[in-house]
Interface confidence: low
């Protein structure tokens, strides 16, 4: 004998207390596939988490984070706090990147400049918190005849020192 | 096992300027920054600036900003800290340390090199 | 730039704890290391991050940042922990202070 219950569609539950017939959802759950015998409780968007898609019947909630926050975590799971580029996140926060370090983003972490003279350059940009450096040809590619390039003073941004 | 090497005593006359040395062995010399700190006689720790030596480029203290440079030697694993125009009150023991890769603490620390100005 | 302040004495008895103080603006948004020094020999570190103790420091030596404060206690102090006591930070500029120093007396 099939199970009545199979006939139950997405957004209705099988409800043994009624004979196995198909009851709509309650307010605030779902189901989003047939032949469930229960109802999922909606995802509720509380706090830092926001509101993406609303719930209904068939499918969860969807959330996301409010302004300064971004999401960690597939389907949004945690939300963690937006720095500034040229900062990363710590216990303590956000923090400026170490001297020799840049984040060009508002989310992840401090990364180390580009090391021109492994590739054989020489430094054309000097690196900040927030960009690379920008690597030109080699000191030897510079020959007298040649147009030179420069490289700018190093970078002194008021209270960045090295370790 | 890491160790900081710095270079012997010096006496120095007003005016002039001193240039101390410290080389670093036992570890990856390009990938820490070394700093120099210094202890006037019975005074406390003063950062004077520091280098990464891989990068280069020093930043310092803006009390010694214009008298102080830092520079490093990866052939050598060496770091040098020049103080120019030296006073009496620069008299003090000068130490290199380095910090340790994931905080801000000097986690080792040269054995100190006493310059002593005096006319 | 953050300015650190340490009283400039502290006396313990033996066996007993010592606590070192160590103020300044909202300094437990940065983090605290501390540094023991002897009469004539270079500092040593004892606590870095705020808390966490180097290999080979023993465990009576703790540490703690939050608000305006940091601070280093000593359990159990023993007569071999008289020496000199400075904080220092670093804000994430790494921009390095110390404070001025805290001389332990172990009575």
């Known amino acids: 004998i099939q199970d009545s219950c199979s006939n139950c569609p997405a957004g209705t539950f099988c409800d043994n207390n009624r004979s196995q017939i198909c009851s709509p959802c309650p307010p605030n759950s779902f189901s989003s596939a047939g032949g469930q015998r229960t109802c999922d409780i909606c995802r509720q968007c509380k706090g830092v988490f926001r509101t993406r898609k609303e719930c209904s019947s068939t499918s969860n909630a969807e959330c996301d984070c409010i302004s300064g926050f971004h999401c960690l975590g597939a389907g949004c799971t945690m939300c963690e706090q937006d720095c500034k580029q040229g900062q990363e996140l710590t216990k303590k926060g956000c923090k400026d990147c170490c001297f020799g370090t840049f984040n060009d983003q508002k989310r992840g972490i401090c990364r180390p400049w580009t090391n021109c003279s492994l590739d054989g350059k020489s430094v054309l940009v000097n690196g900040t918190k927030e960009r690379d450096v920008v690597c030109g040809p080699s000191p030897a590619d510079l020959s007298p005849g040649a147009s030179s390039v420069t490289p700018p003073a190093p970078a002194r941004e008021p209270g960045h020192s090295p370790q | 096992q890491v160790q900081l090497v710095q270079s012997g005593a010096e006496v120095k006359k007003p005016g002039s300027s001193v240039k101390v040395s410290c080389k670093a062995s036992g570890g990856t010399f390009n990938s820490y920054a070394i700093s120099w700190v210094r202890q006037a006689p019975g005074q406390g720790l003063e950062w004077m600036g520091g280098?990464?030596?891989?990068?280069?480029?020093?930043n310092y203290a803006q009390k010694f900003q214009g008298r102080v440079t830092i520079t490093a030697d990866e052939s050598t694993s060496t770091a040098y800290m020049e103080l120019s125009s030296l006073r009496s009150e620069d008299t003090a023991v000068y130490y290199c340390?380095?910090?340790?890769?994931?905080?801000?603490?000097?986690?080792?620390w040269g054995q100190g090199t006493l310059v002593t100005v005096s006319s | 730039d953050i300015e650190l302040t340490q009283p400039p004495s502290v006396s313990v008895a033996p066996g007993q704890t010592a606590r070192i103080s160590c103020s300044g603006d909202n300094l437990g948004d940065y983090y605290a290391s501390w540094y023991q020094q002897k009469p004539g020999q270079a500092p040593v570190l004892v606590i870095y991050d705020d808390s966490n103790r180097p290999s080979g420091i023993p465990e009576r030596f703790s540490g703690s940042n939050s608000g305006n404060t940091a601070t280093l206690t000593i359990s159990g102090t023993q007569a071999e922990d008289e020496a000199d006591y400075y904080c220092q930070t670093w804000d994430g500029t790494l921009h390095f202070v110390f404070g001025g120093g805290t001389k332990l007396t172990v009575l």
């Open positions: 340390a380095r910090k340790n890769e994931e905080d801000g603490g000097f986690d080792h």
């Open positions: 280098i990464i030596p891989g990068f280069g480029t020093a």
